[in-house]
């Protein structure tokens, strides 16, 4: 959380000579940006600072999850007088600076979005030259990743008293509604488990007791689409076979 003091009073006083009012440190980011999984998103971030005409070395940083302490996903550095910010870190090669930090713009492009990218991101700029100072957005921009449903697991499992149960787990954003269909079922929502902490995009539906042999189909649907998968239950001599 260190913010280094400005080195020289000359630097401070010089900022006041001009007619326009001196800026202070501030960062402007939108509360939220939405994009679909597989697409790209732009995370806007612009800033103001009190060091007028600063052209010394600077570093632009984006981190995920938590300000000040979250893991860095992108970092670039620009040499004195240079407008080129050389990328030093781009997690999985999917992060690219769109803005020009010399023009107070740290906007970032994220490629090939996945649901796991759905979190908050925090921009930061560091000056290191005649002036040593830094600032980080405290509230960040929430990247909201939407995705059509995808069934990630469907299975039949033994349960007590020689019975069987079926589980269907799907991911998507908004979290998909799950429905089971199958022999003597009609269309059933079954027992749907809410998304778990830390697994907000996963939803699981359970059929607690499969009473008939045959094909059981799980359908996942949200506003972006639907997906389905099936398992087959055959009870030959107490054994079960399942395929999807």
């Amino acid at each position: 959380f260190v913010r280094t003091k400005i080195d020289t009073t000359e630097n401070l006083l010089n900022t006041e000579v001009h007619s326009s009012p001196a800026q202070r440190w501030s960062m402007q980011v939108p509360p939220e940006v939405s994009a679909e999984a597989g697409d790209a998103a732009v995370l806007p971030c612009t800033f103001t600072h009190p060091h007028r005409h600063y052209d010394g070395p600077l570093t632009a940083i984006w981190r995920a999850g938590e300000p000040y302490a979250g893991p860095q996903v992108f970092r670039c550095a620009a040499a004195r007088g240079s407008e080129l910010c050389q990328t030093a870190l781009s997690l999985h090669g999917r992060f690219r600076l769109l803005g020009n930090p010399r023009r107070n713009d740290l906007s970032l492009r994220v490629e090939r979005l996945a649901l796991a990218d759905d979190r908050r991101y925090f921009c930061r700029v560091e000056f290191a030259g005649d002036v040593h100072d830094r600032y980080e957005s405290r509230h960040g921009v929430r990247l909201h990743v939407t995705a059509a449903p995808r069934i990630v697991n469907i299975s039949v499992l033994p349960s007590p008293a020689h019975a069987f149960r079926a589980l269907c787990t799907a991911e998507g954003e908004p979290p998909p509604a799950l429905a089971w269909s199958g022999p003597a079922l009609g269309n059933s929502l079954a027992a749907v488990r809410s998304p778990r902490e830390g697994h907000g995009h996963l939803v699981t539906a359970e059929l607690p007791a499969l009473t008939h042999d045959g094909r059981y189909t799980c359908t996942a649907a949200n506003s972006l689409g639907r997906s389905e998968a099936s398992v087959y239950l055959f009870r030959f001599h107490g054994a079960s076979g399942a395929s999807t």
């Epitope: 280094t4 003091k5 202070r24 938590e66 000040y68 405290r138 509230h139």
Partner: antibody, heavy 116, light 109 residues
Framework: QVQLQESGPGLVNPSGTLSLSCTVS???????YSWVRQPPGKGLEWIGE???????NHNPSLKSRVTMSVGKSTSQLSLILNSVTAADTAVYHC???????????WGPGTMVTVSS | SSELTQDPAVSVALGQTVRITCQGD??????ASWYQRKPGQAPILVMY???NRPSGIPDRFSGSNSRNTASLTITGAQAEDEADYYC???????????FGGGTKLTVLG
């Protein structure tokens, strides 16, 4: 509408531990929350802040005695202040930093007296 | 120094303009925020950033910044503006929140 409500013991023995809670209602816990106190007849004093992901920042003068935590599932923030003295007698507030460097929502505060 | 300095007390005639000031080195780097506190009530944020009012704050409140000084101006002070006013900012070395000592505003008449 977001509301904050502090709760605490009211009276704490000298050298004891002050434990306060702040309940956040009307929204999920997000961003930064500060603890601020005001001793009788004096001004506001910042104790520290906690981010919803658990990161903290403290007033150096109190850091060795302060522990802050956040419970997202219970929508509660907590403040623990150890080794209290009469100088810790104050109205204690929790406040949300919902605007850049601005504490935009405050709890009504809870009065804590340190006395035997 | 890591301090914000305010005048302890200021008075203004009803309907007139008053300016409350806050001085400190940190104000060269960070914008001030301003809080209104009335007896027995929680503080209310009335100004933040360069000159931003939270929703619900009357437009007679405005803010400005110059060098190491931040100012809160009330144009056409009302009786209900009588309160203690605190400025807040961040310390440039460790980013802790600083509060000024407060200014007691009295509205006369």
């Amino acid at each position: 509408q977001v509301q904050l409500q502090e709760s605490g013991p009211g009276l704490v023995n000298p050298s004891g531990t002050l434990s306060l809670s702040c309940t956040v209602s009307g929204d999920s816990i997000r961003n930064w929350y500060s603890w601020v106190r005001q001793p009788p007849g004096k001004g506001l004093e910042w104790i520290g802040e906690i981010h919803d992901n658990g990161g903290t920042n403290h007033n150096p003068s109190l850091k060795s005695r302060v522990t802050m935590s956040v419970g997202k599932s219970t929508s509660q923030l907590s403040l623990i202040l150890n080794s209290v003295t009469a100088a810790d007698t104050a109205v204690y507030h929790c406040a949300r930093e919902g605007l850049p460097d601005g504490l935009d929502i405050w709890g009504p505060g809870t009065m804590v007296t340190v006395s035997s | 120094s890591s301090e914000l300095t305010q005048d302890p007390a200021v008075s203004v005639a009803l309907g007139q303009t008053v300016r409350i000031t806050c001085q400190g080195d940190s104000l060269r780097s960070y914008y001030a925020s301003w809080y209104q506190r009335k007896p027995g009530q929680a503080p209310i944020l009335v100004m933040y950033g360069q000159n931003n009012r939270p929703s619900g704050i009357p437009d007679r409140f405005s803010g400005s910044n110059s060098r190491n000084t931040a100012s809160l101006t009330i144009t056409g002070a009302q009786a209900e503006d009588e309160a203690d006013y605190y400025c807040g900012s961040r310390d440039t070395s460790d980013y802790r929140v600083l509060f000024g000592g407060g200014t007691k505003l009295t509205v006369l008449g």
